[in-house]
């Protein structure tokens, strides 16, 4: 005879499993009785059920009202149970050994497969969710939509942040040039440029206020390093120095006469309206704050 | 090879039993189950009854009380016996060989026509 | 008693098509569950046991799925001689039922 099993039993959680165990006879023999057992690596066999033929079905007291047979009409040689409401606990291997006359025991081992789904249909466990699906492509959709508003919103902000940026820096810079320069007129008697603090021109590094540091989920905002343009225009502080090397000499004649000479040549860069200074137009400006830092 | 041979009368008078011979060979009553399925006509398959290898019987709820399978080992040979017939259990009765799980029918016989009518 | 549901009811199509045919038990039927097909004043004969196993002899375009209390029989490439009557059978309580059928006919 041989006995017939599956290798696989899967079921999904809170569901029955059927763990089939069928034994083919040979010509007049019969089935005395079929023992279940649960068998996993490791561990001593744990009994489940014993099927009897004269005296029906034992459960052992651990799975006390979860172990039936199937429901008649049953063939006699068949040594199926049903596994009530599975659980994950149950997933692992399970035997059947079958006691037969005169042939024998005969035994078989199948997995019991114990799935847990989001949203277990008792119609099919395979069956697509039509309804979770559509919920995770809305979100997916929600998820991209947003991502894009906010690159859309960043990309918005750093626009209007350039432009108003710009606008200060314009604004400044006439302010501080002709505010320099006015006095720079009327004490040139006695300022020396050469007595200025040296910490008074140096470049001030700032962060850089559009910097953005991006932590968002979102793949689409890639980090571009920003595209910062270096001035090549003579600044303010380079035009006074060159004034300075103009005239090496000591007298005191001579430096007013030489000051003079570089404010002339510093009015190059400047136009003269409505009484104030302006720098002229430059496709390159430089903004000079208030205290004569570069930034 | 497995072969099932049906022997039965094709009319029956209304009221009276109705009893079919199904013979086998190519296999053992003592290994396998034999089933009783029928069919009117143009219409569909009905289950009646199974009698297992070990000689135990199931049969259909709805028939219980009129139905009774029996087999002689010796002669491969399954008993079929109905009373009471009425014109509506007219169809063709088939016997069937119970395979591989031990339920599902593998092989079947050639079918007897029988008509209920006076 | 658990009702089989079989659909669709009959079928025309052509030699080369694939065809799925579907049955649906009242209640968990636990893959007890073969399928039939018969031919015109002949006796059936199994194609599919136990929902998805392919009975001896049965050729491979046909094939069985299924679980719980939704079942289907799926034919690829249809051949001429496949054309017929098809019948699922559950084995879950008594009595046993069979499904009303599918008629499958040449187009």
């Known amino acids: 005879g041989e006995l017939e099993t599956s290798d696989v039993v899967t079921v999904v959680l809170g569901q029955d499993a059927k763990l089939p165990c069928f034994y083919r006879g040979d010509s007049g023999e019969q089935v005395g009785q079929v023992a279940w057992a649960r068998v996993d690596a490791g561990e001593g066999a744990q009994e489940l059920a014993l099927l009897h033929s004269k005296y029906g079905l034992h459960v052992s007291p651990a799975y006390e009202g979860r172990v039936e047979q199937p429901p008649p009409p049953r063939n006699p040689l068949d040594g199926s149970v049903l596994l009530r409401n599975a659980v994950q606990a149950d997933e692992g291997e399970y035997e059947c050994r079958v006691s037969t006359f005169p042939a024998g025991s005969f035994q078989a081992r199948l997995r019991l497969r114990v799935l847990v789904v989001l949203d277990p249909q008792e119609d099919s466990g395979k069956q697509v969710d039509l309804v979770s699906a559509s919920v995770v492509v809305v979100g997916v959709i929600a998820a991209l939509l947003f991502c894009l508003l906010v690159v859309v919103v960043v990309l918005m902000s750093r626009y209007h942040r350039r432009k108003a940026q710009q606008m200060t820096q314009k604004y400044e810079e006439e302010l501080t040039l002709t505010r320099e320069n006015s006095i720079r007129r009327l004490h040139s008697h006695h300022t020396d440029p050469r007595s200025q603090p040296e910490e008074s021109v140096g470049l001030r590094a700032e962060g850089h206020p559009d910097s953005l540091k991006d932590n968002s989920s979102c793949s689409v905002m890639s980090e571009e390093p920003e595209g910062r343009s270096y001035s090549t225009l003579t600044t303010v502080r380079e035009i006074e120095t060159q004034t300075e090397l103009l005239s090496p000499g000591s007298g005191r004649a001579e430096e007013e006469e030489d000051q003079d000479e570089g404010i002339k040549q510093a009015m190059n860069h400047f136009v003269q309206e409505n009484g104030t200074l302006r720098a002229k137009p430059t496709g390159n400006g430089i903004y000079i704050n208030g205290r004569g830092h570069l930034v | 090879q497995v072969q099932l041979k049906q022997s039965g009368p094709g009319l029956v008078q209304p009221s009276q039993s109705l009893s079919i011979t199904c013979t086998v060979s190519g296999f053992s009553l003592t290994n396998y189950g034999v089933n009783w399925v029928r069919q009117p006509p143009g219409k569909g398959l009905e289950w009646l009854g199974v009698i297992w290898s070990g000689g135990s019987t199931d049969y259909n709820a709805a028939f219980i009380s009129r139905l009774s399978i029996s087999k002689d080992i010796s002669k491969s040979q399954v008993f079929f016996k109905m009373n009471s017939l009425q014109a509506d259990d007219t169809a063709k009765y088939y016997c069937a060989r119970e395979g591989y799980d031990g339920y599902a029918m593998d092989y079947w016989g050639q079918g007897t026509s029988v008509t209920v009518s006076s | 008693d658990i009702q089989m549901t079989q659909s669709p009811a009959s079928l025309s199509v052509s030699v080369g098509e694939t065809v799925t045919i579907t049955c649906r038990a009242s209640e968990n039927i636990f893959s007890s569950l073969a399928w039939y097909q018969q031919k015109q004043g002949k006796s059936p004969q199994l194609l599919v046991y136990g929902a998805t196993n392919l009975a001896d002899g049965v050729p491979s375009r046909f094939s069985g799925s299924g679980s719980g209390t939704q079942y289907s029989l799926k034919i690829n490439s249809l051949q001429s001689e496949d054309f017929g009557t098809y019948w699922c059978?559950?084995?879950?309580?008594?009595?046993?039922?069979f499904g009303g059928g599918t008629k499958l006919e040449i187009k």
């Open positions: 059978q559950h084995f879950w309580g008594n009595p046993w039922t």
